[in-house]
Interface confidence: low
C-alpha cells in the first residue's frame, strides 16, 4: 500500500513519542561517536519535518524515502570526516548504496567509555529534573554501544527503565529498590543485544533462507499445534521485521512488529493456547511477551515422520516440485515433535536430509538410497547431548567461576591469536551456560545450552571479523552457521602458535584491585590466566591451577596489608618469579 509520504505514514502509525525514540536509536546506531546533544538536535529537526508532512503529504521533500531523508540528515554532521574517517565517503554515494555503506561501518566494539552508574540520588535527581532527557539518554547510550539492538525491544527496555525510576525514586530505600532492577535490565539487555546480533548476522552473512529456516524450526517448537501454512505466514512476516531492523529501517520494523503482534493475537486460536496472557498486555509488553512465550503442548498422537519423509514413494516427486517448501515441511514436522532439541540441531538434521535427497533423487533406486536417512541423525543428536552432559557435570563440580576458567584455558589453547579481552568476554559468557541451562531437566537442556552457545560464539565471530587474526576462527565462523559450535568444539590446541614473549608488566598488579567489585576482580584474574596460557600454551591444568591459586592468595594477602601498594610491588615480584619457575618460563 503506497503512501504519498513514507515519513508521514510512519509518524501517524507510531505516534510522536515512538517516532522520536526510534529515530534517535537509528541515528545513534549509525553515528556511534556523536554527542547526545547533536543527535537530539537532528531528531528534533526530522520530527518537525515529519509534522509538516503529516499536515500536507504533498509538501516539498515529503515524498522522499526514509533512507534519503535520514541519510541526508546524517550527512549534515559537520565533524563527520574527523570523527568517522572513511565513513564520510558514504555521503558521496546515492541511495541505496549510501545506506549500505553506513551499515558496513557499524562498529560492534566501539571505542566508548564504560558506562559508570552514578549514585542513586544523583540518578533520581536527574530523572525528576528532566525525565524526557534522562530516558532519551538511556536510548542513546544503549543504541550507540549496541548498533544492532532490536529497536522496538529497546523501547520496551526504556519503558521498564522509566518504571523502575518512577517506583524506586519514591521508595524509602531507593538503592535497594533500584539497583537490582537496573542490574536485571543490564543483564537482560546484553542478552537481548547478543540474540539480535545473531539474527542480523544470520540474515547478512548467510541470507534470508538461513534465517527463515531458523524461524521455521523455532516457531514450530513454540507453536506445535499451528498448521504449517500458519507457521509459514508467521515466518515470512517475522523475516520482514528482522530484515528491516537489521537494515536500519527501524520505523518500518517497529510498525511491522506491531502488526505481527496484532495478527498473532487476533488468530491465537489457530496458533497457540499460551498467548492469552500476552495478548492482554499493552503493545510493547505484548510483543516482548509473544517473543518469549513458552512452547505450547504438542498435539497428541502425531503420526510417525517416516511415513511422509522416508517410506512414501512420492518423496523425490514432492521434493522436486518445491524443494524449499518440502524441506520446510520436514523441518516443521520434526521441530514440533522435538522441543527437546536445539534449533541448530534441527537445522543440521534438515541439512542432512536435504543432502541425502539431493544425492538419492538422482540415483537409480532413490527409495533404497534414502531409506536409512534417519539413521544418519543418531550421531548428530548424540554429539550435543554428550557434550552438554559432560560440561554440566564439570560445571556442577567446579562452579561458575572455575568453569569459566576451564573454558578460558580451552579456548585460549584453541585460538591463542584472539585478543585477550575478547577471549575473556567470550569465555565468561560461554561459562554462564552452566548456571543458565544445567539446572534444567534433560528435556530443556539442549535447546537452552546449544542455542545460547550459538549466540555467544556469534559474539566471537563479529568481534573477530573487525580485526581478523585467526584463520581457524574465520573458518568456523564463515563455513556454516549451524555448525559453528561443533566446529569450535572440534578445534584442538593450535600447534602452529608461537608463544608470546613473557612481559612482567602484564602480571604487575596494584592496590586498585582491592576496591574492585567481585566481578571486576574475577576479570582481572581471568585476564592474567589467558596471558599465562598465551605465554605457556603447553602448561598443564595442574600447573595453571597452582599459579592461579598462588595469585588469588597474593591478592587476598595484599588487600589485607596495611601498606597495600608496597605489598603488591614486593610480593608481586616474588609471585612472577615463582610462576615463571613453576611454568618453566
Amino acid at each position: 500500500d503506497a503512501h504519498k509520504s513514507e515519513v508521514a505514514h510512519r509518524f501517524k502509525d507510531l505516534g510522536e513519542e515512538n517516532f522520536k525514540a526510534l529515530v534517535l536509536i537509528a541515528f545513534a546506531q549509525y553515528l556511534q561517536q556523536c554527542p547526545f546533544e547533536d543527535h537530539v538536535k537532528l531528531v528534533n529537526e526530522v520530527t518537525e519535518f515529519a509534522k509538516t508532512c503529516v499536515a500536507d503529504e504533498s509538501a516539498e521533500n515529503c515524498d522522499k524515502s526514509l533512507h534519503t531523508l535520514f541519510g541526508d540528515k546524517l550527512c549534515t554532521v559537520a565533524t563527520l570526516r574527523e570523527t568517522y574517517g572513511e565513513m564520510a565517503d558514504c555521503c558521496a554515494k546515492q541511495e541505496p548504496e549510501r545506506n549500505e555503506c553506513f551499515l558496513q561501518h557499524k562498529d560492534d566494539n566501539p571505542n566508548l567509555p564504560r558506562l559508570v552508574r552514578p549514585e542513586v540520588d544523583v540518578m533520581c535527581t536527574a530523572f525528576h529534573d528532566n525525565e524526557e532527557t534522562f530516558l532519551k539518554k538511556y536510548l542513546y547510550e544503549i543504541a550507540r554501544r549496541h548498533p544492532y539492538f532490536y529497536a522496538p525491544e529497546l523501547l520496551f527496555f526504556a519503558k521498564r527503565y522509566k518504571a523502575a525510576f518512577t517506583e524506586c525514586c519514591q521508595a524509602a530505600d531507593k538503592a535497594a529498590c533500584l539497583l537490582p532492577k537496573l542490574d536485571e535490565l543490564r543483564d537482560e539487555g546484553k542478552a537481548s543485544s547478543a540474540k539480535q546480533r545473531l539474527k542480523c548476522a544470520s540474515l547478512q552473512k548467510f541470507g534470508e533462507r538461513a534465517f527463515k529456516a531458523w524461524a521455521v524450526a523455532r516457531l514450530s517448537q513454540r507453536f506445535p499445534k499451528a498448521e504449517f501454512a500458519e507457521v509459514s505466514k508467521l515466518v515470512t512476516d517475522l523475516t520482514k521485521v528482522h530484515t528491516e531492523c537489521c537494515h536500519g529501517d527501524l520505523l518500518e520494523c517497529a510498525d511491522d512488529r506491531a502488526d505481527l503482534a496484532k495478527y498473532i493475537c487476533e488468530n491465537q486460536d489457530s496458533i497457540s493456547s499460551k498467548l492469552k496472557e500476552c495478548c492482554e498486555k499493552p503493545l510493547l509488553e505484548k510483543s516482548h511477551c509473544i517473543a518469549e512465550v513458552e512452547n505450547d503442548e504438542m498435539p497428541a498422537d502425531l503420526p510417525s515422520l517416516a511415513a511422509d519423509f522416508v517410506e512414501s514413494k512420492d518423496v523425490c516427486k514432492n521434493y522436486a516440485e518445491a524443494k524449499d517448501v518440502f524441506l520446510g515441511m520436514f523441518l516443521y514436522e520434526y521441530a514440533r515433535r522435538h522441543p527437546d532439541y536445539s534449533v541448530v540441531l534441527l537445522l543440521r538434521l534438515a541439512k542432512t536430509y536435504e543432502t541425502t535427497l539431493e544425492k538419492c533423487c538422482a540415483a537409480a533406486d532413490p527409495h533404497e538410497c534414502y531409506a536409512k536417512v534417519f539413521d544418519e541423525f543418531k550421531p548428530l543428536v548424540e554429539e550435543p547431548q554428550n557434550l552438554i552432559k559432560q560440561n554440566c557435570e564439570l560445571f556442577e563440580q567446579l562452579g561458575e567461576y572455575k568453569f569459566q576458567n576451564a573454558l578460558l584455558v580451552r579456548y585460549t589453547k584453541k585460538v591463542p591469536q584472539v585478543s585477550t579481552p575478547t577471549l575473556v568476554e567470550v569465555s565468561r559468557n560461554l561459562g554462564k551456560v552452566g548456571s543458565k541451562c544445567c539446572k534444567h531437566p534433560e528435556a530443556k537442556r539442549m535447546p537452552c545450552a546449544e542455542d545460547y552457545l550459538s549466540v555467544v560464539l556469534n559474539q566471537l565471530c563479529v568481534l573477530h571479523e573487525k580485526t581478523p587474526v585467526s584463520d581457524r576462527v574465520t573458518k568456523c565462523c564463515t563455513e556454516s552457521l549451524v555448525n559453528r559450535r561443533p566446529c569450535f568444539s572440534a578445534l584442538e590446541v593450535d600447534e602452529t602458535y608461537v608463544p608470546k614473549e613473557f612481559n612482567a608488566e602484564t602480571f604487575t598488579f596494584h592496590a586498585d584491585i582491592c576496591t574492585l567489585s567481585e566481578k571486576e576482580r574475577q576479570i582481572k584474574k581471568q585476564t592474567a590466566l589467558v596471558e599465562l596460557v598465551k605465554h605457556k600454551p603447553k602448561a598443564t591444568k595442574e600447573q595453571l591451577k597452582a599459579v592461579m591459586d598462588d595469585f588469588a592468595a597474593f591478592v587476598e594477602k595484599c588487600c589485607k596489608a596495611d601498606d597495600k601498594e608496597t605489598c603488591f610491588a614486593e610480593e608481586g615480584k616474588k609471585l612472577v618469579a615463582a610462576s615463571q619457575a613453576a611454568l618453566g618460563l
Epitope: 537482560e188 492469552k276 496472557e277 492482554e280 518469549e292 513458552e294
Partner: nanobody, 126 residues
Framework: EVQLLESGGGLVQPGGSLRLSCAAS????????VAWFRQAPGKGREFVAG????????YYADSVKGRFTISRDNSKNTLYLQMNSLRPEDTAVYYC???????????????????WGQGTLVTVSS
C-alpha cells in the same frame, strides 16, 4: 496448566512466626511469576509479596516490608513465605498465585494471575 497447593497456616500469637509453602506442579516454578495474596474476612484479595519469572526480583506490599520474605526453591518447585513479627491484622486466608510466561514483573493485580491455590488460613491471636 499449573496446580498450586499451600500449606503451613495455623494459629500463632502476635509477634510469632510462620512459614507458608506452596508446592507447584505442571510447570517449573522458576519460569513463572508467583505471588502470595491474602483475603481477610469481609475484604478483597490483597497482594502480599511476589517474585518474578526466571529472575529473583522480589516485591512486597508496604504493610509487610521488613517482616515477610518471599523465596522459592527451584529444585523442590516450591514457593515460600516466611512471616515474622506477625500482627493480628495479618489474620487472613493466604493464597499462592502464578502467572506463567516468565513475566519479570510480578503484578499486584489479582486478576492477572490465572492459577490459584485453595488457600491456607493464618490466624494471629493471643
Amino acid at each position: 496448566e499449573v496446580q498450586l497447593l499451600e500449606s503451613g497456616g495455623g494459629l500463632v500469637q502476635p509477634g510469632g512466626s510462620l512459614r507458608l509453602s506452596c508446592a507447584a506442579s505442571g510447570r517449573y516454578i522458576d519460569e513463572t511469576a508467583v505471588a502470595w495474596f491474602r483475603q481477610a474476612p469481609g475484604k478483597g484479595r490483597e497482594f502480599v509479596a511476589g517474585i518474578g519469572g526466571g529472575v529473583d526480583i522480589t516485591y512486597y506490599a508496604d504493610s509487610v516490608k521488613g517482616r515477610f520474605t518471599i523465596s522459592r526453591d527451584n529444585s523442590k518447585n516450591t514457593l515460600y513465605l516466611q512471616m515474622n513479627s506477625l500482627r493480628p491484622e495479618d489474620t487472613a486466608v493466604y493464597y499462592c498465585a502464578a502467572r506463567p510466561g516468565r513475566p519479570l514483573i510480578t503484578s499486584k493485580q489479582a486478576e492477572l494471575y490465572p492459577y490459584w491455590g485453595q488457600g491456607t488460613l493464618v490466624t494471629v491471636s493471643s
